[in-house]
């Protein structure tokens, strides 16, 4: 046969020679010939390729920058990069996690729909119709009216989102 | 075009050194392949020597590895054959080669 | 060593007839990727030799297409489709999957 056009899988096409791809974790000292085999050596310290590969230099493992709230969650390998996440009460900013912001607080009238997480942040919902949040937090919930009737009380002022219910004793009834 | 030219003597005397020069043109020796000395003894046989690397390198066949060394000259895109303590069985057609390109041969007699 | 033998020593042949050269290797030439190092190459008389496959099956630019070699692991075949006039002379075998290379003994192609 005349030298190939196209090559098989692990494989590239360079000067008319179907070549050795590298294998994930090295890169490409040198092209195969037609009597010599790809040349590949392992990535250094710090450094990573994650596919089958034809680089001549390895990735940087990203720096997870400790000034901008980042800190490891899962080292990376010859074969994996680093990946980043956020100190605790702070979320990334992108799927890439480059920075870190704080978790935002749902104001009062406002409770926590979803806790934020390392890559997500806080969910707030408004409080509906019997349920009250009258602080700023990222953790609180809204929580439920009290219930007068259940303590043998009446409602003296009406409860908002913002606000629980005032409950009272019941007027006597006159002789 | 990449062409390898050989130099070198004819004639060598017993228990002497045998040097050859490979100069190529067209293809830089240090951005690939294995730069191979061969010989062709009479009678046809032919037998492989050793190479230099394009990073400098190099591997002997074990028969010879106490007597052959290759060596390089980057700036002058050459490579060179030093055999030691030669023999009249060394007595060949020696040849350098990228073995997809080969040199016009020398022939060496060994004899005093 | 991987040991090369080439058969037969001397194939004579009438122009127009197929020619089958046959190289033996005394182990696996096949390599971890898959991939087999086996060349041949062609030598007339006073001439360096040139190289016709190399990887076992691939032509060198400018072969003509009535050559084509074959084989795998230690078993390997040069065929001439049609020999012509130019064809005549000495074929060798050369693996070089291990170091050392290693060629064959050489198959001298002559008229019947």
């Known amino acids: 046969p005349e030298p190939p056009t196209a090559c098989r899988e692990k494989q590239y096409l360079i000067n008319s020679q179907c070549c050795s791809l590298c294998q994930p974790g090295q890169k490409l000292v040198s092209d195969c010939t037609e009597f010599t085999e790809t040349e590949c050596l392992p990535c250094g310290e710090s450094e990573f390729l994650d596919t089958w590969n034809r680089e001549t230099h390895c990735h940087q493992h990203k720096y997870c920058d400790p000034n901008l709230g980042l800190r490891v969650q899962q080292k990376g390998t010859s074969e994996t990069d680093t990946i980043c996440t956020c100190e605790e009460g702070w979320h990334c900013t992108s799927e890439a996690c480059e920075s870190c912001v704080l978790h935002r607080s749902c104001s009062p009238g406002f409770g926590v729909k979803q806790i934020a997480t390392g890559v997500s942040d806080t969910i707030c919902e408004p409080c509906p119709v019997g349920f009250f949040s009258n602080v700023s937090s990222a953790f609180e919930k809204c929580h439920p009216w009290t219930s007068c009737e259940t303590k043998d009380l009446v409602v003296q002022q009406a409860g908002t989102n913002k606000t629980d219910v005032v409950c009272g004793p019941q007027d006597r009834l006159r002789a | 075009d990449i062409q390898l030219q050989q130099s070198g003597p004819g004639l060598v005397k017993p228990s002497q050194s045998l040097s050859l020069t490979c100069s190529v043109t067209?293809?830089?020796?240090?951005?690939?392949?294995?730069w191979n000395w061969i010989r062709q003894f009479p009678g046809n046989k032919l037998e492989w020597m050793g190479y230099?690397?394009?990073?400098?390198?190099?591997e002997y066949t074990p028969s010879l590895k106490n007597r052959v060394s290759i060596t390089r000259d980057t700036s002058m895109n050459q490579f060179f054959l030093r055999l030691t303590s030669v023999t009249p069985e060394d007595t060949a057609t020696y040849y350098c080669?990228?073995?997809?390109?080969w040199g016009q041969g020398t022939s060496v007699t060994v004899s005093s | 060593d991987a040991v090369m033998t080439q058969n037969p020593l001397s194939l004579p042949v009438s122009l127009g007839d197929e020619a089958s050269i046959s190289c033996r290797s005394s182990?696996?030439?096949?390599?971890?990727?898959?991939?087999?190092?086996l060349n041949w190459f062609f030598q007339k008389p006073g001439q360096s030799p040139q190289l016709l496959i190399y990887?076992?099956?691939n032509r060198f630019s400018g072969v003509p297409d009535r050559f084509s070699g074959s084989g795998s692991g230690t078993d390997f075949t040069l065929k001439i489709s049609r020999v012509e006039a130019e064809d005549l002379g000495v074929y060798f075998c050369?693996?070089?999957?291990?170091?050392?290379?290693?060629f064959g003994g050489g198959t001298t192609l002559e008229i019947k």
């Open positions: 067209g293809y830089s020796i240090t951005t690939n392949y294995n």
């Open positions: 182990q696996s030439l096949e390599n971890s990727n898959g991939n087999t190092f």
């Open positions: 050369l693996q070089v999957t291990h170091v050392p290379y290693t």
């Open positions: 080669a990228r073995l997809d390109y």
């Open positions: 230099i690397r394009y990073d400098g390198t190099s």
């Open positions: 990887r076992v099956s």
